[in-house]
Interface confidence: low
Amino acid sequence: EDWQCPRTPYAASRDFDVKYVVPSFSAGGLVQAMVTYEGDRNESAVFVAIRNRLHVLGPDLKSVQSLATGPAGDPGCQTCAACGPGPHGPPGDTDTKVLVLDPALPALVSCGSSLQGRCFLHDLEPQGTAVHLAAPACLFSAHHNRPDDCPDCVASPLGTRVTVVEQGQASYFYVASSLDAAVAASFSPRSVSIRRLKADASGFAPGFVALSVLPKHLVSYSIEYVHSFHTGAFVYFLTVQPASVTDDPSALHTRLARLSATEPELGDYRELVLDCRFAPKRRRRGAPEGGQPYPVLRVAHSAPVGAQLATELSIAEGQEVLFGVFVTGKDGGPGVGPNSVVCAFPIDLLDTLIDEGVERCCESPVHPGLRRGLDFFQSPSFCPNPPGLEALSPNTSCRHFPLLVSSSFSRVDLFNGLLGPVQVTALYVTRLDNVTVAHMGTMDGRILQVELVRSLNYLLYVSNFSLGDSGQPVQRDVSRLGDHLLFASGDQVFQVPIQGPGCRHFLTCGRCLRAWHFMGCGWCGNMCGQQKECPGSWQQDHCP
């Protein structure tokens, strides 16, 4: 009988304590927001906001420019000065709540917690491969804004998400803000609004459309906007909010809100509950039917999927899928089952479910007792009636009013609970070759790059490494610049290659050569490495 090498256990073929050093930038304060820009003439930039300051970095993460965004009332505040001679409001620090690109101009828009949540527009000026910010424009017209009606009050100190959409020649800002009674009383930001940026950059056009939590619910009904994105004909917001206006406000669930990206209207505003569960292969006694619910969304990202995952999700390759990391509650603390689970919601399926929900509400035969919902935004009513009305009048359409779809969209953990104790705090999904990879940041400052596949009893790691020594949580927002992802942790920004930081964590030649093609790994004497790391022989096709 032939002698065979003893099999190395899979886990023993890699070492996740291997240190990788990736390029980084120290921002000088807790990173509050970050966004990247790639121009069509090879120029690129990373914009990093901390309290009272905005940094402009080159593609190598070297500082190119720095701008003082606060404190408001301080003579050194460069953005404040763009609004002309003050005072413009109470003095105070500026925490950046919104940092987005308007790609059409192109320009960077920043909005802070000070000065009624107003925004500033910074035109981008390419200089070689780097980018500079032009002098900021103050997006605030004093004569247009009142405490009860303020088109230029965009950012809420409690958090705001913005997605910019080009419609014709105009830029529309789809804005979602968390409110409470105090914030709502001060220059009245709205929960959800669509605002047109005025062509002369003096602010936003008045008369914008908006939905807001009704005053009577502001104290108890808090909506957290976790993520927003634009794909196809729609803009989507993802929220964590109480499951009911009338019941326990601490019983939370996750919703997807859909708005038209082609018409700046809110009549076709729709919400759908997203239900993510952990369903172990073998159900324990007493475990809930259908799996354990993970109702609270922590982070999300949408991306087109590779062939393998597409097949598993029964969709076409390249179709857009919304990925979410969910936890059991706000604290995300330990319970039975894993700390974090990942669910995948194909966008086309989401849209179909929403459209079917509209049909159920608006088409005969009428389903008795079917509520229009969204009672925190509008007067209660039953389908097909408009909010607050007993019946449809002949010249109104059931479809032209906001609606909560009556069914939810259920999915189970793609990783089958294998994330275990890991608390995921950041997520970005990419397609590499035909592989779909989840790039995840964790509560303890690590990066996990894992292939997204179902039905395995182990995780397929591209990498699992520590970003630095601080062990601080990786922040929610991740940006891409070329073939790199930018993660923030504490006061640092880190640049992580999407192909992984290297190959040294693969300990055996067999495991090294079975790494994904895109990682570029080969056996190099006695270690796994990329060709540039190997002065001598580098073997990609067979082991010695």
Epitope: G168, A170, R196, K198, A199, D200, A205, G207
Partner: antibody, heavy 119, light 107 residues
Framework: EVQLQQSGAELVKPGASVKLSCTTS????????IHWVNQKPDQGLEWIGR????????KSDPKFQVKATITVDTSSNTAYLQLSSLTSGDTAVYYC????????????WGQGTSVTVSS | DIQMNQSPSSLSASLGDTITITCHAS??????LNWYQQKPGNIPKLLIY???NLHTGVPSRFSGSGSGTGFTLTISSLQPEDIATYYC?????????FGGGTKLEIK
């Protein structure tokens, strides 16, 4: 009901100026754009320019930049088109129209003002 | 400026016919194309916006299609009240420009 009411026909001499008005009702003028379009006898439509009443921002065809000035008075919901240094070639019907969202489409039109330039 | 070329410039058809008018843009205008109808002695009226969206109150026998540089307006089952001149107009960039018009007559 959305309406755009234009001022009456004008007969003017070459070299003179004229100011046409367009008074809107049934909607808030600052929530839309107001466009001006002309149509010469037995010819097609020609875009002159538009104004954003919310902030007075104007866009116009370069060939009309000297000839035409668009203004707005939001307090009276009225847009104006001033035409200067008129020649017989400026004889046309001038329409104001409401912008449809930001699609650069015009969904409601005034009845038109006929301007005849003749000595 | 973006040129809009409309063809044919005139067209004669019988009641009940289906007719097609085409509009070609000199550069890519995505879907930012609008169609108008102007009946003799009347003001223009918006028929279709953003290439294929029927404006409120416009009969469903009118339809629009296309994107990029090529667009069509189709009228199925021609009616007497469809006698008019039809114009396309691009909304992609300033200055906005119209096609030269297509005059539709009934045989």
């Amino acid at each position: 009901e959305v309406q755009l009411q234009q001022s009456g026909a004008e007969l003017v001499k070459p070299g003179a100026s004229v100011k046409l008005s367009c008074t809107t009702s049934g909607f808030n003028i600052i929530d839309t754009y107001i466009h001006w379009v002309n149509q010469k006898p037995d010819q097609g439509l020609e875009w002159i320019g538009r104004i954003d009443p919310a902030d007075g921002n104007r866009k116009s065809d370069p060939k009309f930049q000297v000839k035409a000035t668009i203004t707005v008075d939001t307090s009276s919901n009225t847009a104006y088109l001033q035409l200067s240094s008129l020649t017989s070639g400026d004889t046309a019907v001038y329409y104001c129209a409401r912008g449809y969202g930001n699609l650069n489409a015009m969904d409601s039109w005034g009845q038109g003002t006929s301007v005849t330039v003749s000595s | 400026d973006i040129q809009m070329n409309q063809s044919p410039s005139s067209l004669s058809a019988s009641l009940g016919d289906t007719i097609t008018i085409t509009c070609h843009a000199s550069q890519n205008i995505n879907v930012w194309l609008n169609w108008y109808q102007q009946k003799p002695g009347n003001i223009p009226k918006l028929l279709i916006y953003k290439a294929s969206n029927l404006h409120t109150g416009v009969p469903s026998r009118f339809s629009g299609s296309g994107s990029g540089t090529g667009f069509t307006l189709t009228i199925s089952s021609l009616q007497p009240e469809d006698i008019a001149t039809y114009y396309c107009q691009q909304g992609q960039s300033y200055p906005l420009t119209f096609g030269g018009g297509t005059k539709l007559e009934i045989k």
